[in-house]
């Protein structure tokens, strides 16, 4: 079965900077990736970025840069402009639409005890959908 993994990482040098890494493990070709925060896409989550393998990437604040890391993984850099760090307690979700599997989504967050520079373990909370 396909699987989506999510890692959230706080940058060691910039405590207000976070990076979300997501990947798709499975056959088929990825047609679109959506990254949201605060919950799954379409279930209360707010879209941060949309990445298409050929048409390009789009992102909205507080996302700073969305990019493809490999053909099946992406990263999203976030900049926290506030004095406090709301990202620390936020859930980030990545939804991969692939052909012919359908859509697969997983969520993750920064562990409460995380030190800067350490990332959350790839423990996906899969929301399995075949849209």
């Amino acid at each position: 079965t396909p699987e989506v993994w999510v890692q959230v990482q706080m940058e060691a040098t910039e405590l207000s900077s976070f990076t979300v890494h997501c990947g798709f493990l499975g056959p088929g070709s990825i047609s679109l990736v959506t990254v949201s925060w605060g919950g799954p896409d379409g279930a209360g989550g707010t879209k941060l970025a949309v990445l298409h393998p050929e048409l390009g990437t789009r992102q909205w604040a507080p996302a700073r840069q969305a990019r493809w890391e490999t053909q099946s993984s992406i990263s999203l850099a976030l900049e926290d402009s506030g004095a406090s760090s709301p990202f620390a307690n936020t859930t980030f979700c990545c939804k991969f639409a692939s052909f012919p599997e359908g859509s697969w989504e997983s969520c993750g967050s920064l562990p409460p005890s995380s030190d800067p520079g350490l990332s959350a373990p790839p423990t996906p909370v899969p929301i399995l959908r075949a849209d």
């Epitope: 707010t46 879209k47 949309v50 298409h52 393998p53 050929e54 048409l55 390009g56 990437t57 789009r58 909205w60 604040a61 990019r67 493809w68 890391e69 490999t70 053909q71 993984s73 992406i74």
Partner: antibody, heavy 114, light 113 residues
Framework: EVQLQQSGPELVKPGASVKISCKAS????????INWVKQSHGKSLEWIGD????????NYNQKFKGKATLTVDKSSSTAYMELRSLTSEDSAIYYC???????WGQGTTLTVSS | DIVMTQSPSSLSVSAGEKVTMSCKSS????????????LAWYQQKPGQPPKLLIY???TRESGVPDRFTGSGSGTDFTLTISSVQAEDLAVYYC?????????FGSGTKLEIK
């Protein structure tokens, strides 16, 4: 079939403001991310900015910051672009287009003249 | 901002001829992660909005005739029309789809003799 229907031509005086609309149909509105593009007479295309319909997140071309403001009304599936402090330089055709520019509105002609 | 430079600015050909137009970007449009080039080509006929022809530098949009071919990588790209038809009379624009702000070339105007 996705369709973007833009508001009609506008003739406005210098210094005034104008609000152009772009109504989307043929899909769930929250699936639409709207780009706005300017085309001055006989000239090339300039990207103004884009807006994400769920939370109204925006990106602007630095050149149009302070000139254009992008908003959405989810209840009517409509995106808006307001242009302020208009001058003759703002006279152009303004287009809305979907996220990856694969569907375009028919264009709204703006003429700024006293 | 990424500057897109197109050449020639205009060209005039007879129906059935092959046409090539160039687009150069001031920065690479290649994403090293997935080896995709984020460049698009548009066709704008008189009195109409632009129409997406090619994306990812070489992928034809659905419904676009196969006489249109996009090629190139990095900073140098080409749009080729293998056998020009009368309905291809238009201005062709390339676009940086790689990074904000999305920028367009100045266009190549294709006229039919």
């Amino acid at each position: 079939e996705v369709q973007l229907q833009q508001s009609g031509p506008e003739l406005v005086k210098p210094g005034a403001s104008v609000k152009i609309s772009c109504k989307a149909s043929g899909n769930t509105f929250t699936d639409y991310y709207i780009n706005w593009v300017k085309q001055s007479h006989g000239k090339s295309l300039e990207w103004i900015g884009d807006i994400e319909p769920n939370n109204g997140g925006t990106n602007y071309n630095q050149k149009f910051k302070g000139k254009a403001t992008l908003t959405v009304d989810k209840s009517s599936s409509t995106a808006y672009m307001e242009l302020r402090s208009l001058t003759s330089e703002d006279s152009a055709i303004y287009y809305c287009a979907t996220l990856y520019f694969d569907y375009w509105g028919q264009g709204t002609t703006l003429t700024v003249s006293s | 901002d990424i500057v897109m430079t197109q050449s020639p600015s205009s060209l005039s050909v007879s129906a059935g001829e092959k046409v090539t137009m160039s687009c150069k970007s001031s920065q690479s449009l290649l994403n090293s992660g997935n080896q995709k080039n984020y460049l698009a080509w548009y066709q704008q006929k008189p009195g109409q909005p632009p129409k997406l022809l090619i994306y990812g530098a070489s992928t034809r949009e659905s419904g676009v005739p196969d006489r249109f071919t996009g090629s190139g990588s990095g900073t140098d790209f080409t749009l080729t029309i293998s056998s020009v038809q009368a309905e291809d009379l238009a201005v062709y624009y390339c676009q940086n789809d790689h990074s904000y702000p999305f920028t367009f070339g100045s266009g190549t105007k294709l006229e039919i003799k």
